[in-house]
Interface confidence: low
């Protein structure tokens, strides 16, 4: 066990805190919850601080909870290839480039790492080049998530790891606004990281409302586990 | 200083409900996660449930959940503990512990500030 795994055998509180603009609209956004690494579960309220918020919730999802990457399930024969609970507790910085298909682009930057007993996301996001009346700043987006498949590989050179995948937007007139997310996660510390061999994380998560809850709000539920990666052939044979 | 006063304990039958109630004083309510914590005769102090600061996140201890219910009302700086279905077996000190935190935890030493208890027997 590394010893940052040893931080995430239990429940862990989260806290997500995002300044974001895009084109030009400021806004802030702050989640709390907790996160469950045994299971890869993630339980989320994000509340808009600023309003309304001037993005649809489910181009940000990959910002806030594939943020907390940390969280994900790795089964015993994958733990050595996880880097992201290595990292902790003093963190990592994660970057991404999206790319909107036919619209513009988001660039974030966060550091993820725990603050006393709380794994906290604080990220800056920066949008440019939307269409007013495109997908997103149109709001034309279903309040819903696909599952998909994050693909991981070692990036020897920054001692991290480069991420890479497609996230699928539904769109209310029944097509699909394509999001393409090139992540780089690199260490805080200088103490050593797991760098993993090649392989991903599947994801699923549900998007609902808090009944009670009357500003701009997304309420949270994913699950995350690691796969890609057979037990070695001595396994087999046991 | 903090203060947190507990108030709402009694005798029940099984069965019946309560509500405890816990006053804060003395601070920035609004930036404390709160706990419930209870201690019967002989027993070590247990978690009971807690509520995040900003009233978003609630969790409990397995053999109350669905029974208890942890609300926080910020403009009241009240934490309360609805105590539904009560069994015998529930009968203990009802403790509210503060921590200036996003989130409750189970731990009893992360908490600054406790309440002097409420007596509540089933």
């Known amino acids: 066990m590394s010893k940052g795994e040893e931080l995430f055998t239990g429940v862990v509180p989260i806290l997500v805190e995002l300044d974001g603009d895009v084109n030009g609209h400021k806004f802030s956004v702050s989640g709390e919850g907790e996160g469950d690494a045994t299971y890869g579960k993630l339980t989320l309220k994000f509340i808009c601080t600023t309003g309304k918020l001037p993005v649809p919730w489910p181009t940000l999802v990959t910002t806030f909870s594939y943020g907390v990457q940390c969280f994900s399930r790795y089964p015993d024969h994958m733990k050595q290839h996880d880097f992201f609970k290595s990292a902790m507790p003093e963190g990592y910085v994660q970057e991404r480039t999206i790319f909107f298909k036919d619209d513009g682009n988001y660039k974030t930057r966060a550091e993820v790492k725990f603050e006393g007993d709380t794994l906290v996301n604080r990220i800056e996001l920066k949008g440019i080049d939307f269409k007013e009346d495109g997908n997103i700043l149109g709001h034309k987006l279903e309040y819903n998530y696909n599952s998909h498949n994050v693909y991981i590989m070692a990036d020897k050179q920054k001692n991290g790891i480069k991420v890479n995948f497609k996230i699928r937007h539904n769109i209310e007139d029944g097509s699909v606004q394509l999001a393409d997310h090139y992540q780089q996660n690199t260490p805080i510390g200088d103490g050593p990281v797991l760098l993993p061999d090649n392989h991903y994380l599947s994801t699923q998560s549900a998007l609902s409302k808090d009944p009670n809850e009357k500003r701009d709000h997304m309420v949270l539920l994913e699950f995350v586990t690691a796969a890609g990666i057979t037990h070695g052939m001595d396994e087999l044979y046991k | 200083q903090v203060q947190l006063v507990e108030s709402g304990g009694g005798l029940v039958q099984a069965g019946d409900s309560l509500q405890l109630s816990c006053a804060f004083s003395?601070?920035?309510?609004?930036?404390?996660?709160m706990g419930w914590f209870r201690q019967a005769p002989g027993k070590e102090r247990e978690f009971v449930g807690g509520?995040?600061?900003?009233?978003?996140?609630?969790n409990y201890e397995d053999s109350v959940k669905g029974r208890f219910t942890i609300s926080k009302d910020n403009t009241k700086n009240t934490v309360y503990l609805q105590l539904n279905s009560l069994k015998p077996e529930d009968t203990a000190v009802y403790y509210c512990a503060a921590r200036n935190n996003i989130l409750p935890v189970t731990t009893i030493d992360k908490y600054e500030y406790w309440g002097q208890g409420t007596q509540v027997t089933v």
């Open positions: 003395g601070g920035t309510f609004s930036t404390y996660a």
């Open positions: 509520i995040s600061r900003s009233g978003a996140t609630t």
